[in-house]
């Protein structure tokens, strides 16, 4: 899978993680910090 950085207009999209762009799927994806989940890393898990 080929990945690059997300475009600058995606700044802040991932609430607790890093945005990466999945080139093959033409989709943005959030790589969450430890302890977070969700498509935008929006949920802390207890």
């Amino acid at each position: 899978v080929s990945i690059t950085k997300c475009s600058s207009d995606m700044n802040g999209y991932c609430l607790h993680g890093q945005c990466i762009y999945l080139v093959d799927m033409s989709q943005n994806y959030c790589r969450c910090e430890v302890g977070y989940t969700g498509v935008r890393c929006e949920h802390f898990f207890l």
Partner: antibody, heavy 118, light 112 residues
Framework: QVQLQQSGPELVKPGASVKISCKAS????????INWVKQRPGQGLEWIGW????????YYNPKFKGKATLTVDKSSSTAYMLLSSLTSEDSAFYFC???????????WGQGTLVTVSA | DVLMTQTPLSLPVSLGDQASISCRSS???????????LEWYLQKPGQSPKLLIY???NRFSGVPDRFSGSGSGTDFTLKISRVEAEDLGVYYC?????????FGGGTKLEIK
């Protein structure tokens, strides 16, 4: 308009598995979570987990890990929940509900009744 | 997990009365965004739950203004200013701040 259409009632034997469906329409399927909620007859609501359809991400309530498996078919905008090793405790209504990121359950399916009986 | 405790379990009211339902979370459900994802749902017999209130105090579209939500931190309240027959059913609070999400145990609003 947004609609979630669930599959019909199921009568299954103890120890068996059942797969129920939730067909979404009226919105872009890959832009919202599909959540699943359990309700035993006369009882309250229990949250099972969610699936984000694309790219697929799931989260399960630890209580339902190993009991429920959530999947999607993007081509038909349908979410599925497989319930395995069924016992009488799994006899319940199961609802699907749509939830955008950090938004409420604004839309619900009509519910699917699963009855586990020998 | 966050435990959501609703009181009372049953609430007998006369039509036209005010009704108040309490929901207490076992820990703070304030999100890192500063929002609190506390919601209220009404389920009538034989129906799916319906959204009434989201983010503590916001009425969902089409919900009458006799419904209001309030609270912060761990203590939340749903008030119905003048109960009508169509309001009868089971009310659930719910939090969607952390995972796993949890529902309260429900409060049955019934005629006295």
């Amino acid at each position: 308009q947004v609609q979630l259409q669930q599959s019909g009632p199921e009568l299954v034997k103890p120890g068996a598995s059942v797969k129920i469906s939730c067909k979404a329409s009226g919105y872009t399927f890959t832009d919202a979570y599909i959540n699943w909620v359990k309700q035993r007859p006369g009882q309250g609501l229990e949250w099972i987990g969610w699936i984000w359809p694309g790219p697929v991400i799931t989260y399960y309530n630890p209580k339902f890990k190993g009991k429920a498996t959530l999947t999607v078919d993007k081509s038909s905008s349908t979410a599925y929940m497989l319930l395995s090793s069924l016992t009488s405790e799994d006899s319940a209504f199961y609802f699907c509900a749509r939830r955008e990121v950090l938004s409420p359950f604004a839309y619900w399916g009509q519910g699917t009744l699963v009855t586990v009986s020998a | 997990d966050v435990l959501m405790t609703q009181t009372p379990l049953s609430l007998p009211v006369s039509l036209g009365d005010q009704a108040s339902i309490s929901c207490r979370s076992s820990q703070s459900i304030v999100h890192s965004t500063g929002n609190t994802y506390l919601e209220w749902y009404l389920q009538k017999p034989g129906q799916s739950p319906k959204l009434l209130i989201y983010k503590v105090s916001n009425r969902f579209s089409g919900v009458p203004d006799r419904f209001s939500g309030s609270g912060s931190g761990t203590d939340f309240t749903l008030k119905i200013s003048r109960v009508e027959a169509e309001d009868l059913g089971v009310y659930y609070c719910f939090h969607g701040t952390h995972v796993p999400y949890t529902f309260g145990g429900g409060t049955k609003l019934e005629i006295k």
